[in-house]
Interface confidence: low
């Protein structure tokens, strides 16, 4: 407990504050300089409130009193009652706490009384008579808000020393009302004043945030910075932005470019703008508008295939008349047969490989510990979140913690268990036109993807095949996976795959291979099921593993956590095949390139808003173009932007009611106990 | 990956000072955004912070210890250290030293594995 | 004395929730402060568990959750495990102190 001083002094919370005067008043003295600094005598209510006006009254003098905001009126005795008939200054008499110094005594009470505090002991109360002049009172202030005491910073001469709205100066305040001033003396010899002002957020706030002191240091808050404080050697502070974000006009905060950028697809921070929009492959920007983007048609490049082209929304294919197969650079035709023996056997080893051998030095994810758990017809979608940064804010999620259900169409075969052994870029025979997608084949050293040839496309399979891939995946001599950038990459493809004749159809695997697109090689092998004549193949994608960093793989963009098409989710396929490909699964990470949802065949939402009614497949063996839409998944909200600053907003002084007229003429013919304390 | 390790003696002698050594590795201590702390816990008991420091010197002690303690940077060595002087008995527990980080400068993201100092006669 | 109270011990069994609260006062919670929890398993030093009064850092299983209201701030561990089974601190900045506060840790004990 504070050491009774003669200085007024006050005890704040974030609602009230309680402020002791030392100064001898009459109980309407008292009321009055409480109303005049616009509030009331203290009616401490609950056992909070009296904690805290202990706290503040401290150890008093022995036999000193303060006024508090209780008054009786005369012949209103109510001795049974908690206030024994008193009234509040509120013009009340709610309360859940008294503190009486004597029991209540029966009999008359002819005088008006009013009720004082002890300034020592345990502060009870005692009543007397109202124009005495005792030694103080306590007011009582409500308020709207109240603001923090600001933390000491490097640089500061001392604490910020504050000035209530009650004319109080303290710099022992834990929080100021609405409307203090801090006054904050730097050791460089400046100053700052800071105002509680309202936000226009709703709440009170200090009108200035960041280094109150700059050029002095960090401080114990991080210099004001939201993301890292630089100290410099001459002592001058700058704030800095974590990758990817942006340094706002107030030179503390920080924003992500990308967050309310327009950008169809892609986005980079970077750029006259903040951002620069970026299309993804087979697509470009469109003429009229950067930020939209519009499908490339490759078939128009002469030469894009040796034979035959089909355009598709974001690629192409190059596929072969009857008798020839496509080459291993997915351009080429060559007349069918050629190479297919030993391949089919190189494929027929590798699809029968253990697994086990050189699992560590190939795999990017050799060490992903997830599983996966299918019911016969629904594929479950557990949300992930995207790494802590650190951050003032962390994205919002669409139903966030809630498995995702789609339902898809419950005649499967049952799923299969997942595959554990190193995954290869192996493809599989098929008597069906399984066309092989080159994103981009014109340039050099394109990726030569494995080949699946077709001899008579209109049939229906006569065996139930195995799933090829809409895109091999590629395996890289360094054993990393490469940079790529938003745009049309150099793809550097160091290995070939073997081709696979239509002769020569494989044996089934004892895993499925993997299904990984050209444009983005990191991708998570699959898990399929088997097919069945005339009905899709369902691909089902796990989740990207939780410690694959996809930081390093691609250009230092950023990518919303949870929207279609994230880096190793995408398995680019073709109408033109039998794979009915599925949503893409959010990824875990804060990956390469900032994306945003764009409607495509092969590209459902990542989170329906309500579950996929169940369809039936249909065979789309002479389909091209693109049978299905889907509308575009909501953007991802952001948190913790920044409110504008806010224009300082004075607080308005509440009326509250006033106490019962007192008698302020001479009180003769009542008794003498009247006059004294009891 | 920041790693902190706490260096010192493990025993000493009641009113000498105590004098521990926190050497970081796996990144700079001027690196700036972060304090270097130190924190001790009684045998049984809960943590209690000692102070922090930035590259730069500027300290902050706990009241209760800051007429005893002294925090010093060595950028050079990217070492932090603690002293105490006047130690006593209730001196005796396991001091960690870590990395702070956050907007209040309060959030101890990385810990050294801490060391015993006994003060005993 | 500025003090963080929490209680001496909690216990659960596995696959329970429990929580762990921690009060302060207008000087460190009340004042705005963010809370911070730290696990302490037997023998090691403490691990940053939540910061920011409910964020984890990575590695951190979503069992553990904060909350913070007013002068008080609470930890949450959902479907306890046994390797749950170790000290819980609170932490928060005060400003009397013009710096950190831990509170007086938490035993838990999975049945």
């Known amino acids: 407990q504070v050491p009774w001083t003669p200085e007024p002094r006050a005890a704040c919370g974030p609602s009230s504050c309680y402020a002791l005067f030392p100064r001898r008043r009459t109980f309407l003295e008292a009321w009055r300089a409480c109303r005049e600094l616009g509030g009331n005598l203290a009616t401490p209510r609950t056992p909070e409130e009296a904690q805290r006006v202990d706290s503040l009254v401290g150890v008093g003098p022995a036999n000193g009193l303060l006024w508090i905001g209780l008054q009786r009126q005369a012949r209103q005795c109510q001795p049974q009652r908690p206030l024994r008939g008193f009234i509040w200054t509120t013009g009340d008499q709610d309360t859940a706490f008294t503190n009486w110094a004597q029991p209540a005594t029966e009999g008359p009470c002819p005088a008006q009384r009013c009720a004082a505090l002890e300034a020592s002991g345990e502060h009870r109360w005692l009543e007397g008579s109202c124009t005495l002049a005792v030694d103080g009172y306590l007011c009582q202030f409500g308020f709207e808000g109240a603001c923090p005491a600001l933390p000491l910073e490097v640089g500061q001469a001392g604490p910020a020393v504050y000035t209530t709205p009650f004319n109080l100066v303290s710099s022992e305040f834990e929080w100021l009302p609405f409307g203090s001033v801090a006054a904050v003396q730097c050791q460089a010899g400046r100053g700052a004043s800071l105002l509680c002002v309202k936000q226009p957020s709703g709440g009170v706030g200090w009108s200035q945030t960041g280094p109150l002191c700059p050029g002095t240091g960090c401080g114990p808050d991080n210099g004001g910075c939201e993301h890292e404080c630089v100290e410099e050697v001459d002592g001058a502070v700058s704030c800095r932005c974590s990758e990817g974000f942006r340094l706002a006009a107030d030179g503390h905060s920080c924003e992500d470019p990308c967050a309310q950028a327009p950008c169809e697809q892609q986005c980079e921070p970077g750029g006259p703008q903040g951002y620069s929009c970026h299309c993804r492959l087979g697509f470009r920007p469109a003429e009229d508008d950067p930020h939209r983007c519009v499908d490339t048609d490759e078939c128009q490049i002469a030469g894009v295939c040796q034979q035959m082209c089909v355009n598709y929304v974001g690629g192409f294919e190059c596929y072969c008349s009857e008798g020839h197969e496509l080459e291993a650079d997915g351009i080429s035709c060559s007349p069918a047969g050629a190479m297919g023996a030993q391949a089919s056997q190189d494929l027929r080893d590798e699809l029968l490989d253990d697994g086990e051998e050189g699992e560590d030095e190939e795999e990017p994810w050799e060490d992903f510990d997830g599983t996966w758990t299918e019911e016969q017809g629904i594929l479950w979608l557990a949300p992930t979140h995207p790494p802590d940064f650190g951050l003032p804010y962390r994205p919002n999620f669409p139903q966030d913690g809630e498995p995702q259900r789609l339902h898809l169409e419950p005649t499967w075969p049952p799923p299969l268990s997942a595959p554990r052994g190193p995954y290869h870029s192996s493809v599989v025979s098929a008597t069906r036109p399984m066309v092989i997608s080159a994103t981009r084949p014109t340039l050099p050293s394109a990726h030569k993807t494995s080949v699946i040839s077709a001899t008579r496309p209109p049939l229906s399979p006569v065996h139930p095949p195995a799933m090829a891939p809409a895109t091999p995946p590629a395996v890289f001599s360094e054993h990393q996976i490469p940079k790529i950038k938003a745009n049309y990459p150099d793809l550097p493809f160091g290995h070939k795959p073997g081709i696979t004749s239509a002769t020569h159809p494989a044996r089934s695997p004892p895993y499925q291979p993997p299904i990984i697109s050209t444009n983005y090689p990191q991708v998570f092998p699959p898990h399929q099921a088997p097919m069945s004549p005339d009905t899709h193949t369902i691909t089902y994608l796990p989740p990207v593993p939780p410690h694959l960093d996809p930081g390093d793989t691609t250009s230092k963009a950023h990518q919303h956590p949870l929207l279609p098409d994230a880096p190793g989710i995408r398995t680019q396929a073709p109408q033109l095949s039998v794979s009915a490909l599925q949503p893409p699964l959010p990824t875990n990470s804060r990956s390469s390139v900032h994306e945003t949802p764009v409607p495509a065949a092969n590209q459902p939402p990542a989170f329906p808003s309500s579950p996929l009614p169940p369809q039936r497949p249909t065979n789309q063996t002479s389909s091209i173009s693109p049978t299905h839409s889907y509308s575009r998944a909501p953007l991802v909200p952001r948190e913790g932007v920044p409110s504008p600053k806010s224009v300082p907003q004075l607080p308005s002084v509440p009326s509250t009611a006033a106490p019962t007229a007192l008698a302020e003429s001479g009180l003769a013919g009542q008794s003498q106990r009247d006059d004294r304390w009891l | 990956q920041v790693q902190l390790v706490e260096s010192g003696p493990g025993l000493v002698k009641p009113s000498q000072t105590l004098s521990l050594t926190c050497t970081v590795s796996g990144g700079s201590i001027s690196s700036g955004g972060y304090y270097w702390s130190w924190i001790r816990q009684h045998p049984g008991k809960g943590l209690e912070w000692i102070g922090y420091i930035y590259y730069s010197g500027s300290t902050y002690y706990n009241p209760s210890l800051k007429s005893r303690v002294t925090i010093s940077v060595d950028t050079s060595k990217n070492q932090f250290s603690l002293k105490l002087s006047s130690v006593t008995a209730a001196d005796t527990a396991v001091y960690y030293c870590a990395r702070v980080r956050g907007r209040s400068a309060t959030y101890f993201d990385y810990w050294g594995q801490g060391t015993t100092v006994t003060v005993s006669s | 004395q500025s003090v963080l109270t929490q209680p001496p011990s909690v216990s659960g069994a596995p696959g329970q929730r429990v929580t762990i609260s921690c009060t302060g006062s207008?000087?460190?919670?009340?004042?705005?402060?963010?809370v911070r929890w730290y696990q302490q398993l037997p023998g090691t030093a403490p691990k940053l568990l939540i910061y920011?009064?409910?964020n984890r850092p990575s590695g951190v299983p979503d069992r553990f959750s904060g909350s913070k209201s007013g002068t008080s701030a609470s930890l949450a561990i959902t479907g306890l495990q046994t390797e749950d089974e170790a000290d819980y601190y609170c932490?928060?900045?005060?400003?009397?102190?013009?710096?950190?506060?831990f509170g007086g840790g938490t035993k838990l004990t999975v049945l």
């Open positions: 207008s000087s460190n919670i009340g004042a705005g402060y963010d």
């Open positions: 932490q928060s900045y005060d400003i009397s102190l013009s710096g950190s506060l």
């Open positions: 920011a009064n409910n």
